[in-house]
Interface confidence: medium
Amino acid sequence: LQDPCSNCPAGTFCDNNRNQICSPCPPNSFSSAGGQRTCDICRQCKGVFRTRKECSSTSNAECDCTPGFHCLGAGCSMCEQDCKQGQELTKKGCKDCCFGTFNDQKRGICRPWTNCSLDGKSVLVNGTKERDVVCGPSPADLSPGASSVTPPAPAREPGHSPQ
């Protein structure tokens, strides 16, 4: 025998109190699959969470974070604060990048400055907490008649020190 509840579509639940009739989900609840015996309570986006997608009878609400925060965890279950450029977020809060490292974004970790000498180049512009160094031409290119300037080396991936 087929379970009568299997006929209940998403957005409804199989109501045992009413002879297993398919009843619509009550307000602020949803069922995303058919055959459900209960509807799930909609997620509420409060405080630093804001609503990205409203709850419907067939899908949960989706949250993101208010300005100054960014999502962390599955389905944006947490909001982590942004830091300023030149800082990184540790478990104890934002802290300035150490000398020799930089962060040009409001999140992520401080990364080491590019080591120009590894590519045989000189430092054209010194690095700061917010910006990587800019590598210039190699010393050999600075001989009379050489005028081209090599574009800066790409920034290293987070967490990788120069080899």
Epitope: L72, E80, E88, L89, T90, K91, K92, I109, P158, G159
Partner: nanobody, 124 residues
């Protein structure tokens, strides 16, 4: 599948106690540091405490030091947070998290798995 499931949250009066549990599965529990963090509705994520994989080193946020105790039982694959002398400002959703290494990292980037959270409300 690596999974963390928190439990033990609830409503408690100021000055009361609660013990949160985090049941871990899908990985070698004793090989990784574990962390508790919390998120209050109006605030960003706040780190609470971390314990090393071996359980011999613990770290606490200043706001909970002396009131909260983190511990782990590798035979039960469970992480605990004993919370005493609770205050209204401790109200939050508490998440447990698995670190990527046996020793604690200063960063959330060291965290590779999060639980779904358990709600603690401190109110009279």
């Amino acid at each position: 599948e690596v999974q963390l499931v928190e439990s033990g949250g609830g409503l408690v009066q100021p000055g009361g106690s609660l013990r949160l549990s985090c049941a871990a599965s899908g990985f070698t529990f004793s090989s990784f540091a574990m962390t508790w963090v919390r998120q209050a509705p109006e605030k960003g994520l706040e780190w609470v405490s971390t314990i090393s994989g071996s359980g011999d080193t613990t770290y606490y946020a200043d706001s909970v030091k002396g009131r909260f105790t983190i511990s782990r039982d590798s035979s039960k694959n469970t992480l605990y947070l004993q919370m005493n002398s609770l205050r209204a400002e401790d109200s939050a959703v508490y998440f447990c998290a698995k670190e990527a290494t046996a020793m604690a990292s200063d960063y959330y980037y060291g965290v590779d798995v999060w639980g779904q959270g358990t709600t603690v409300t401190v109110s009279s």
